[in-house]
């Protein structure tokens, strides 16, 4: 058993038809020492006296608040929360396994930029009686400060019969250093608790392998004198580092006919501008990637030809 | 570059895109592959890292580009023994188009444009001796391509942003 | 009507055991909260352990001591393991549907003495 926070304790417990369970002992908060009597969430039922309880935790029936009174007033609480473990694995009940880009990934993260800032989300099918909690820092033998802020619920989407819900965290690194080469991953820790179930979940990345620019803007069409070509031109994304010439990108376009089945020449290039040939109907698209680090493409950006 | 002159932008720019690419085509999946190990956060500690201190931002090195310079020739070096070592050439055999080859070269050429012959920095000693398992061998090479794809990667934006902003 | 009926007490040598047993009737036993009480010459009620319908115990202070409670729902049958007994636990045990034993047995005398 440990504490997660004032009043609040997690029982750790090996779940297993007919496991014994653990023996957690819960003492009053009070000088008082007789008349004291124990209660288990709204239930009046009595379940025990004395300033100190024992009480074996087998089950989520054994899971609560207890709380301890005298003369019919409440003099302390103590909230108890099971985190289960199956076959020697911490449960994973309550977040959905995303399989992006393994198995068993039930956080997902990205970074727009080099900043130190970083964005974190995961899904749930649970729609209420749920809480979660982030705690972020750089290494974990020395930490390096992370800051986190309020966890929100950044969209809901249904999936056949059921509704999906997407939770994401922003965190900040508090001395982040742009230009310098990771040597320590971040580590983001999110605790989730469902009525009485606890579960933690962690990630654990550098920033540069988590970095998604985000599409060029400005995207324009200059149609060539005399030509079936046109010259397009982009820009960096304004939440790209800066200067460009230091956090430079790369760009893949291409132009797309109206059938998705015909054929697409991509091109590649460290400039932002480039000549095709744009049918009419067609669209031409460009993403941008980290010139030197081959982390993720950004999603395209488009523009109709005509 | 010794000494205060100034080391052929241009030239070290397209040599540290070149070993970028190839750091990328000798261990292609490293972004996807979860290689960090409890205790990784010391075994890093031996491969040179280019930190916040070394003055290869872009103000570090619009005040005085050596240091930097410095730091990453130390770690070109660094790597072209470790991609020399029987590390890379033990068993497993490396497939003969494999790019490590052209990739140790990379390093020391770029390591020699920014030292001419002649001058000599302090090197950093190779490290511990290699693994005896193959799989373990195989396990390094990974990890110190992994790392090398870091490391070229800030060598390429100093070099990109020197040729953009400091050539004569 | 609810019925509670203890046995197994009886006299033993200080160091000994027994296993004490409560025969319940008249209500839904397997999903009741049970207790163990005892009440010594001269003294009140003491609340010695609490059983849950899952078989999940409670006792008393830091640990559960020489008390082990037991229960077979299958037989609607409440058991107390009493180890090392001492001259001090000479007491009428009781079980109990409340810790105040309000819906109690006529309880079983226990006798500690050599």
């Known amino acids: 058993i440990w504490e997660l926070k004032k009043d609040v304790y997690v029982v750790e417990l090996d779940w297993y038809p007919d496991a014994p369970g653990e023996m957690v002992v819960l003492t009053c908060d009070t000088p008082e020492e007789d008349g004291i009597t124990w209660t288990l969430d709204q239930s009046g039922e009595v379940l025990g006296s004395g300033k100190t309880l024992t009480i074996q935790v087998k089950e989520f029936g054994d899971a609560g608040q207890y709380t301890c009174h005298k003369g019919g007033e409440a003099l302390s609480h103590s909230l108890l929360l099971l985190h289960k473990k199956e076959d020697g694995i911490w449960s994973t009940d309550v977040l959905k396994d995303q399989k992006e880009p393994k198995n068993k990934t039930f956080l997902r993260c990205e970074a727009k930029n080099y900043s130190g800032r970083f964005t974190c989300w995961w899904l749930t099918t649970i729609s209420t009686d749920l809480t979660f909690s982030v705690k972020s820092s750089r290494g974990s033998s020395n930490p390096q400060g992370v800051t986190c802020g309020a966890v929100t619920l950044s969209a809901e989407r249904v999936r056949g019969d059921n509704k999906e819900y997407e939770y994401s965290v922003e965190c900040q690194e508090d001395s982040a250093c742009p230009a310098a080469e990771e040597r320590l991953p971040i580590e983001v820790m999110v605790d989730a608790i469902h009525k009485l179930k606890y579960e933690n979940y962690t990630s654990s990345f550098f920033i540069r392998d988590i970095i998604k620019p985000d599409p060029p803007k400005n995207l324009q069409l200059k149609p060539l004198k005399n030509s079936r070509q046109v010259e397009v031109s982009w820009e960096y994304p304004d939440t790209w580092s800066t200067p460009h010439s230091y956090f430079s990108l790369t760009f893949c376009i291409q132009v797309q006919g109206k059938s998705k089945r015909e054929k697409k020449d991509r091109i590649f290039t460290d400039k932002t501008s480039a000549t095709v040939i744009c049918r009419k109907n067609a669209s031409f698209s460009v993403q941008a990637q980290d010139r030197y680090y081959s982390s993720s493409w950004s999603e395209w950006a488009s523009v109709p030809c005509s | 570059v010794p000494g205060g002159s100034s080391p052929a932008w241009a030239q070290c720019q397209q040599l540290s895109q070149k070993l970028c690419t190839l750091a990328w085509s000798a261990h292609p999946l490293v972004g996807h592959m979860d290689l960090r190990e409890e205790g990784d956060e010391e075994t890093t500690n031996d491969v040179p890292h280019i930190q916040c201190g070394d003055g290869c931002d872009p103000q570090g090195l619009r005040d005085n580009s050596q240091f930097c310079l410095q730091r990453i020739r130390q770690g070109l070096i660094f790597y072209e023994k470790l991609l020399g070592s029987d590390i890379f050439t033990g068993e497993p055999s490396l497939l003969p188009d494999s790019p490590v080859g052209q990739l140790h070269a990379s390093l020391l050429g770029l390591s020699q444009l920014l030292q001419p012959e002649g001058h000599h920095w302090e090197t950093q000693q190779i490290p511990s001796p290699s693994p005896s398992q193959p799989w373990q061998r195989l396990l390094l090479r990974f990890k110190i391509l992994r790392s090398l794809q870091a490391f070229v990667a800030v060598a390429a934006r100093v070099f990109a942003h020197g040729a953009a902003t400091l050539s004569p | 009507e609810v019925q509670l009926v203890e046995s197994g007490g009886g006299l033993v040598q200080p160091g000994g055991s027994l296993r004490l047993s409560c025969a319940a009737s008249?209500?839904?036993?397997?999903?009741?909260?049970m207790f163990w009480l005892r009440q010594a010459p001269g003294k009140g009620l003491e609340w010695l352990s609490t059983?849950?319908?899952?078989?999940?115990?409670i006792y008393p202070g830091s640990g559960k001591g020489r008390f082990t409670i037991s229960r077979d729902n299958a037989k609607n049958t409440l058991y107390l393991q009493i180890n090392n007994l001492k001259p001090e636990d000479t007491a009428l045990y009781y079980c109990?549907?409340?810790?105040?034993?309000?819906?109690r047995g006529q309880g079983t005398q226990v006798t500690v003495s050599s």
């Open positions: 059983i849950k319908p899952t078989g999940s115990t």
């Open positions: 109990a549907r409340d810790i105040g034993g309000t819906v």
């Open positions: 008249g209500f839904t036993f397997s999903s009741s909260v």
